[in-house]
């Protein structure tokens, strides 16, 4: 038997990918063990085998469809269980009646290009990727901006409280190299998280005319 | 400019079926959920149900399921909310929205019904 | 099935004067809470969502707040246009329901 304290988190990315990381205190390395959905009124069920992603803990993503299929609803329940083999047997570890529209967090977004620089300013936009069209604009984004010398850990967040998919930065230092990144969070769903940042943007402002008060 | 237009006023003998129809137009109706609400004198706003028309699923209230039933036909952007076994307390304004599913953004400007003998 | 109570039933106050109205669920719903403005004749219109968010559009005055299963939609300074019937709606458990309404009359 497994001992310990066990923790069993998921997410739903509002589309057909619901990810799961679990946790467990004094787990056994060898075991299989793996992630079971079942919706409560769909006729499919889905299997994904948790793999280890640090000494005492698990993750894998239950792939319900095609990327950009709603495959649930704000109706759905789906009882997720987290099953090892034990011997011939499968033991229930970890289970939860989770609501996908309750946990959600969104794939990070995508295609982040620059629109337009200038020596002080830069306009970026990017897109969202597999969101359900359920949020219609109720979107808000989080981003940040890396200046030379400083973490990401230091930049200050830029807040949209609305679904606008583009950003102008402003007061920047003339031909100088920056990173941009960029997330997205659902205003529904009481355990709603932010998605992962972007991929990071590497931009660089034009260099100030020579001669020039700019 | 979003809009929902329903069609006209209906009056209906009991045991009778009814057909509203919401027209819409400024938003991509393919990719939307349009939903019913009823609007009795004595009982308030009820939900209906839904229409999911990206992903082809309908959903309805408990109280209704039995006797409603919601269709689009995408390629005229008009949703339709049908109710049968009409009774006196049917008579009602019956709305179409559009809004994700959890609250309805814009109104349809209401169809009243009204069942009498 | 969720129910919402609101209180009071009809509520009289005076141009200019701040207006504070009530919704409560039957059980626990989260932030899932969202409040509509009817006037005579007309569809509702969409004020607040999830408890205290505003809609593009809807003017300042109109705020909303939570404390556990109560909430409440505050409009700050009374405009003529503001005397309506507003109803609060919750989307935590389907058949998401509406509140029986509160009628905001001139005093």
């Known amino acids: 038997a497994v001992n310990g304290t066990s923790q069993f988190t998921c997410f739903y990315n509002s589309r057909a990918n619901i990810s799961c990381v679990w946790s467990q205190d004094g787990a056994l390395q060898d075991t299989s063990c793996q992630v079971h959905a079942w919706p409560d009124r769909r006729r499919w069920n889905q299997t994904c085998e948790l793999l280890p992603v640090s000494q005492a803990s698990w993750a894998c993503n239950l792939i319900l469809g095609a990327p950009d299929s709603q495959k649930l609803t704000t109706v759905d329940i789906v009882t997720l269980r987290v099953l090892c083999r034990e011997g011939v047997r499968w033991r229930v570890m970890a289970i939860q009646d989770f609501k996908p529209f309750e946990n959600l967090r969104l794939m990070a977004p995508i295609s982040l290009q620059v629109v337009h620089v200038e020596t002080h300013r830069c306009n970026i936009s990017w897109e969202i990727s597999q969101a359900s069209h359920y949020f219609e604009r109720h979107l808000e984004f989080e981003a940040r901006t890396l200046s030379p010398g400083h973490t990401w850990e230091e930049a200050p967040l830029l807040t949209l409280k609305q679904k606008q998919e583009w950003i102008c930065l402003e007061t920047l230092t003339p031909d100088t190299q920056y990173e941009f990144q960029v997330r997205v969070k659902p205003l529904q769903g009481e355990f709603t998280t932010w998605s992962p940042w972007s991929q990071p943007l590497a931009f660089r402002t034009k260099p100030a005319a020579l001669g020039k008060d700019t | 400019e979003v809009q929902l237009v329903q069609s006209g006023a209906e009056v209906k003998k009991p045991g009778a079926t009814v057909k509203i129809s919401c027209k819409v137009s400024?938003?991509?109706?393919?990719?939307?959920?349009i939903h019913w609400v009823q609007q009795a004198p004595g009982k308030g706003l009820e939900w209906m149900g839904w229409i999911d028309n990206e992903a082809g699923e309908t959903e309805y209230a408990p109280g209704f399921q039995d006797r409603v039933t919601i269709t689009a036909d995408t390629s005229t952007d008009t949703a339709y909310m049908e109710l049968s076994s009409l009774r006196s307390e049917d008579t009602a304004v019956y709305y179409c929205?559009?809004?994700?599913?959890?609250?309805?953004?814009?109104w349809g400007q209401g169809t009243t019904v009204t069942v009498s003998s | 099935e969720i129910v919402m109570t609101q209180s009071p039933a009809t509520l009289s106050v005076s141009p200019g004067e701040r207006a504070t109205l009530s919704c409560r669920a039957s059980q626990i719903i989260s932030n899932n809470l969202h409040w509509y403005q009817q006037k005579p004749g007309q569809a509702p219109r969409l004020l607040i969502i999830y408890g205290l968010q505003s809609i593009s559009g809807i003017p300042a005055r109109f705020s909303g707040s939570r404390s556990g299963t109560e909430f409440t939609l505050t409009i700050s300074s009374l405009q003529s246009e503001d005397f309506a019937v507003y109803f609060c709606?919750?989307?935590?458990?389907?058949?998401?329901?509406f509140g029986q309404g509160t009628k905001l009359e001139i005093k």
């Open positions: 709606q919750q989307s935590n458990n389907w058949p998401y329901t």
């Open positions: 400024g938003f991509n109706f393919k990719y939307s959920l």
């Open positions: 929205a559009r809004g994700g599913p959890w609250f309805l953004s814009y």
